[in-house]
Amino acid sequence: DAHKSEVAHRFKDLGEENFKALVLIAFAQYLQQCPFEDHVKLVNEVTEFAKTCVADESAENCDKSLHTLFGDKLCTVATLRETYGEMADCCAKQEPERNECFLQHKDDNPNLPRLVRPEVDVMCTAFHDNEETFLKKYLYEIARRHPYFYAPELLFFAKRYKAAFTECCQAADKAACLLPKLDELRDEGKASSAKQRLKCASLQKFGERAFKAWAVARLSQRFPKAEFAEVSKLVTDLTKVHTECCHGDLLECADDRADLAKYICENQDSISSKLKECCEKPLLEKSHCIAEVENDEMPADLPSLAADFVESKDVCKNYAEAKDVFLGMFLYEYARRHPDYSVVLLLRLAKTYETTLEKCCAAADPHECYAKVFDEFKPLVEEPQNLIKQNCELFEQLGEYKFQNALLVRYTKKVPQVSTPTLVEVSRNLGKVGSKCCKHPEAKRMPCAEDYLSVVLNQLCVLHEKTPVSDRVTKCCTESLVNRRPCFSALEVDETYVPKEFNAETFTFHADICTLSEKERQIKKQTALVELVKHKPKATKEQLKAVMDDFAAFVEKCCKADDKETCFAEEGKKLVAASQAALGL
């Protein structure tokens, strides 16, 4: 349904508060270096303009597309060329090329200072002094650091952020109340950002079909009682929502997400029995709740898949007449029967089935050709099962920190060209799969672990894409979305790598390490470990363990010393010499 004024339409649908918040997020995700005040000014100008369009949809410029209006506004920023360099060239383009240009310049790793959390009293004062500015600043800081953050979900995070301050700034022990809540929001926010980044990568790098396949599998697991037609409708709508958000169309995305939540709640009976509680919540909570809702129970007595997908004489006819519909039905039927499989595994099975039909439905004896297709699934299912079993055993044996270290060594040997900060970040996140998933029973381990690993490996892929240094990473990242994890798992030590020159500075530590949090101290040690492997890629586990144990003892000793700095300087030299000898550097 066409509206005379798109901006008026969205303003009315979303309301002023959400409209302003979403425009701020959009602008901060595009111009990640701009100061907060500049963005607020731009948002206010857009909001005032939108109000004039609400009053009179025929007013001047009200008929322009949102991309045109927002792009024109962004291109008024005076320091565009100085701050963003070639991104300023986007402003010479016409829509839709201009918006595509802005999207291409989104930076997954912007050069921004780390967010330092002020004292609780300082935060509470700022919150009370100007609640609106305080919350806008939260949206701005998260959006500019996470340019693909799912905008309607960020509104939900902001609502929880506000609730935390409202409650805790009145509490007797403000810090005890607030800090755990902020930690939780931070961790959930990082996870949410990474999950959404995978969705956008899926759409942008592999296309709508890949995203729809993912959505069919996931929604079929979640809503196994829903009919295929219902799942297909949800997939179409969900694809539209995520295409819009990933494309910077945040107002449309938030509006359509609200419509989808409304539809789901109005049709709960034909979707899932688990939606009742979600659907009683207000909009933002409702949408979040639906997105996280547990899988419904599988219908009883589902027939064997073989009847329709192997034994039927119409397999090739059905496939040829509507390939994607037939494959979609296969994926739906398989996924609703297998909540115990990861989505990526289900997609691998569907790809295998598709490849088999492409081959066999052109063969002289199609039925004989595809009769054993389900046998081909067995090794595909066993591979992640075995990998998860082995790694959970290793995790239980080592604990999270040492398990992360094992992965750091493993991945540094596979792709030593990748920057040390990226290897540390990615390996630490890979290592978190242990505490996140290994506690689950067998039936929940694979969907937890492998789908989480897909999210983490996508972080590696997007960071590597910005500055490509390894052909092996590029290959694993670009060849197949669903085979990224098996591709990385299959990589052996890179024999072509020329070890890094030894630099004593890399292994020089100072007393400041003693005042760091446990997490920051771990990162320092893990950074050293990566550098060690880059210098000596053929070092054995035992050699590396010995050096790292010595290093831990050295830090502990010097942090207890009276003259810490002297200890670090003198003992550090000895440690470097001993390590060089131990590793034969």
Epitope: A320, K359, A362, A363, A364, P366, C369
Partner: antibody, heavy 118, light 106 residues
Framework: QVQLQQSGAELVRPGSSVKISCKAS????????MNWVKQRPGQGLEWIGQ????????YYNGRFKGKATITADKSPTTAYMQLSSLTSEDSAVYVC???????????WGQGTTLTVSS | QIVLTQSPAIMSASPGEKVTMTCSAS?????MHWYQQKSGTSPKRWIY???KLASGVPVRFSGSGSGTSYSLTIRSMEAEDAATYYC?????????FGAGTKLELK
């Protein structure tokens, strides 16, 4: 564009063997069946067999089992058919053809004429 | 194996005339394909999956049928249509061709 280029005409003695080739270009050779068809002068078409170069799977017309052996090589994207124990009955034009979904042959080679004569 | 019987074996038609040739299978087949062959050349795919026209085939051609009975029709004969037409079944191993219908220009 898709092309199937066959080897040249062959004149061979009865009892001997011959191997004719079909060089494919312009498509993903591994992902399509390559079929071989026999046509005797003034007569109809007879399907001999097919190979899937991706994994080497083959199907034969029972009438040609033991007579024809179909192989494929992925690196020069070429399919081959060896005919053994040749007799005058094997004199014919042999054509390779790419098979697609639901079993039709969308591209054909130009044909290789085999003459078996003493 | 499935035997395909094409009829007539030979036929002639004047320009503008409607032409129908048939292909009868000894038992039910899934799909029928038709090829056109002119002397000295390899066959060309003409109609596939029973009723779809191959690229470049004039719209005056059509195909239809199911089970054991299939046909190829030319709405209005033209000189360039003179050729031999072969049917081929898919769905039963081995793949088989009919003996052909030779269409001549009257």
């Amino acid at each position: 564009q898709v092309q199937l280029q066959q080897s040249g005409a062959e004149l061979v003695r009865p009892g001997s063997s011959v191997k004719i080739s079909c060089k494919a270009s312009g498509y993903a050779f591994s992902n399509y069946w390559m079929n071989w068809v026999k046509q005797r002068p003034g007569q109809g078409l007879e399907w001999i067999g097919q190979i899937y170069p991706g994994d080497g799977d083959t199907y034969y017309n029972g009438r040609f089992k033991g007579k024809a052996t179909i192989t494929a090589d992925k690196s020069p994207t070429t399919a081959y058919m060896q005919l053994s124990s040749l007799t005058s009955e094997d004199s014919a034009v042999y054509v390779c053809a790419r098979g697609v979904l639901l079993g039709s042959f969308d591209y054909w080679g130009q044909g290789t004429t085999l003459t078996v004569s003493s | 194996q499935i035997v395909l019987t094409q009829s007539p074996a030979i036929m002639s038609a004047s320009p503008g005339e409607k032409v129908t040739m048939t292909c009868s299978a000894s038992s039910s087949v899934s799909y029928m394909h038709w090829y056109q062959q002119k002397s000295g050349t390899s066959p060309k795919r003409w109609i596939y999956d029973t009723s779809k026209l191959a690229s470049g085939v004039p719209v005056r051609f059509s195909g239809s049928g199911s089970g054991t009975s299939y046909s190829l029709t030319i709405r209005s004969m033209e000189a360039e249509d003179a050729a031999t037409y072969y049917c081929q079944q898919w769905g039963s191993n081995p793949l088989t061709f009919g003996a052909g219908t030779k269409l001549e220009l009257k």
